[in-house]
């Protein structure tokens, strides 16, 4: 029951890490703007994202507006949208080939291949939440190396945004959750009891003395 | 604080090419693309191009045969360069920096006043 | 290319009036539209993105509206250093076009 039970906690997190991600992804909110100069005529926050930047105003009126065009985005914004949707989308793909390995179903007969691709499902979702930590930690290098930039203007500096916070959750999920997935399918080869109960009644051995046992007779 | 300082010659032959360096100040060129906008009493604001900042450039298609903008993000310079200039080219020509993802130029330069003649 | 059209090339005003200067796109811009000021011989200065969005410090008296091929500067009160010409671009497709500008000056 061991390996079923990590599989199935080990999958769970990774869906969870999963529409964190996706989340993350589509939130504008990577960089927020740092109040530092309390003499800004009208006080307005800018939110930057992957797609997006949004302006909230004093009024509380706020704006959102896509980015006009990729080649208008620095490359790391750029670089980071790459990264994160390729991060989702192998994701995607792990959650086929982690089912296909799974022991409750049936796409590949039970036995040392199915752990292979089970393993390979949870290997699939560790490098997920690696590809999608590239970008936060760039991202949030960026944000703390120009905040003290002394020659970035204090109306410029950033702070870091909930996307960063909920995209680096959404990481260790996946990455705890591929784990978890890889130990399963480790102990589902080394130790074949430990699986997925499907109980299999073995035939019973003969005796030493060629007779079987006599309580199997009726 | 965020500058653009622009240095250039003030007058030019017809015929002969304008070259003009941005050196830019509180920002990065690896983050934020520089615009070159124009401007003259007859034809008001035209915008020229834009160089961005992963390096592409996009040039408007009544300058691009004789317009080459490029950059050196290390010393933080924008290179503007134009071509077979005549009378009607006399302008001031400003360099802008862009506002991050958008097609807005948001802090201008000082501008450099050209003019074409003999 | 787009056309920006700013009908008036001068708007007279006296300090303390509101004052609105309209700029008509030549098709639906969807509120890709910048305004800018410009004093004497100085550079443009960014007012308003976004049709409506203020640039940063950007004082409250100066809004912005408008939709499609139509769009509005309003100075709500206006003062002295707010006498200028003003500008407005759109942002929807390069090449980026401005209108010829509107001079705004004392009545």
């Known amino acids: 029951m061991g390996s079923a039970a990590l599989e199935i906690l080990g999958l769970v997190l990774c869906l969870v890490g999963w529409g964190g991600l996706i989340l993350a992804c589509g939130l504008p909110m990577w960089q927020v703007t740092a109040f530092l100069d309390h003499n800004i005529v009208t006080a307005q926050t800018t939110w930057k994202g992957l797609w997006m930047s949004c302006v909230v105003q004093s009024t509380g009126h706020m704006q959102c507006k896509v980015y006009d065009s990729v080649l208008a985005l620095s490359t790391e914004v750029q670089a980071a949208r790459a990264l994160t949707v390729s991060a989702v989308l192998l994701a995607f793909v792990a959650l086929f080939v982690t089912l296909a390995g799974a022991q409750c179903t049936t796409c590949v007969a039970p036995g040392p291949a199915k752990a292979r691709v089970a393993l390979t499902g949870g290997v699939l979702y560790l490098f997920c939440g690696l590809l999608a930590l590239v970008p936060l930690c760039w991202f949030a290098n960026i944000v703390v190396r120009e905040f003290y930039d002394p020659m970035t203007p204090v109306n410029a500096r950033y702070e870091f945004g909930q996307a960063l916070y909920i995209g680096w959750a959404a990481t260790a999920l996946l990455m705890v959750g591929g784990c978890l997935l890889c130990c399963g399918a480790w102990v589902c080869t080394g130790r074949p009891d430990l699986s997925f109960p499907v109980k299999y009644s073995a035939p019973r051995r003969p005796t030493a003395t060629g007779d079987y046992d006599k309580k199997n007779y009726v | 604080q965020v500058q653009l300082k622009q240095s250039g010659p003030g007058l030019v032959q017809p015929s002969q090419s304008l070259s003009i360096t941005c050196t830019v100040s509180g920002f990065s060129l690896i983050r934020y693309g520089v615009h070159w906008v124009r401007q003259s009493p007859g034809k008001g604001l035209e915008w020229l191009g834009v160089k961005w900042s992963g390096g592409s450039t996009d040039y408007n298609g009544a300058f691009k045969s004789r317009l080459s903008i490029s950059k050196d993000n290390s010393k933080s310079q924008v290179f503007f360069k134009m071509n077979s200039l005549q009378a009607d080219d006399t302008a001031i020509y400003y360099c802008?920096?862009?506002?991050?993802?958008?097609?807005?130029?948001?802090?201008w330069g000082t501008g450099t006043s050209v003019t074409v003649s003999s | 290319d787009i056309v920006m059209t700013q009908s008036h090339k001068f708007m007279s005003t006296s300090v303390g009036d509101r004052v609105s200067i309209t700029c008509k796109a030549s098709q639906d811009v969807s509120t890709n539209v910048a305004w800018y000021q410009q004093k004497p011989g100085q550079s443009p200065t960014l007012l308003i993105y976004w049709a409506s969005t203020r640039h940063t410090g950007v004082p409250d008296r100066f809004t912005g509206s408008g939709s499609g091929t139509d769009y509005t500067l309003t100075i709500s009160s206006v003062q002295a250093e707010d006498l200028a010409l003003y500008y407005c671009q759109q942002h929807y497709s390069t090449p980026l076009t401005f209108g010829a500008g509107t001079k705004l000056e004392l009545r």
């Open positions: 802008a920096r862009g506002l991050d993802g958008y097609y807005v130029p948001d802090v």
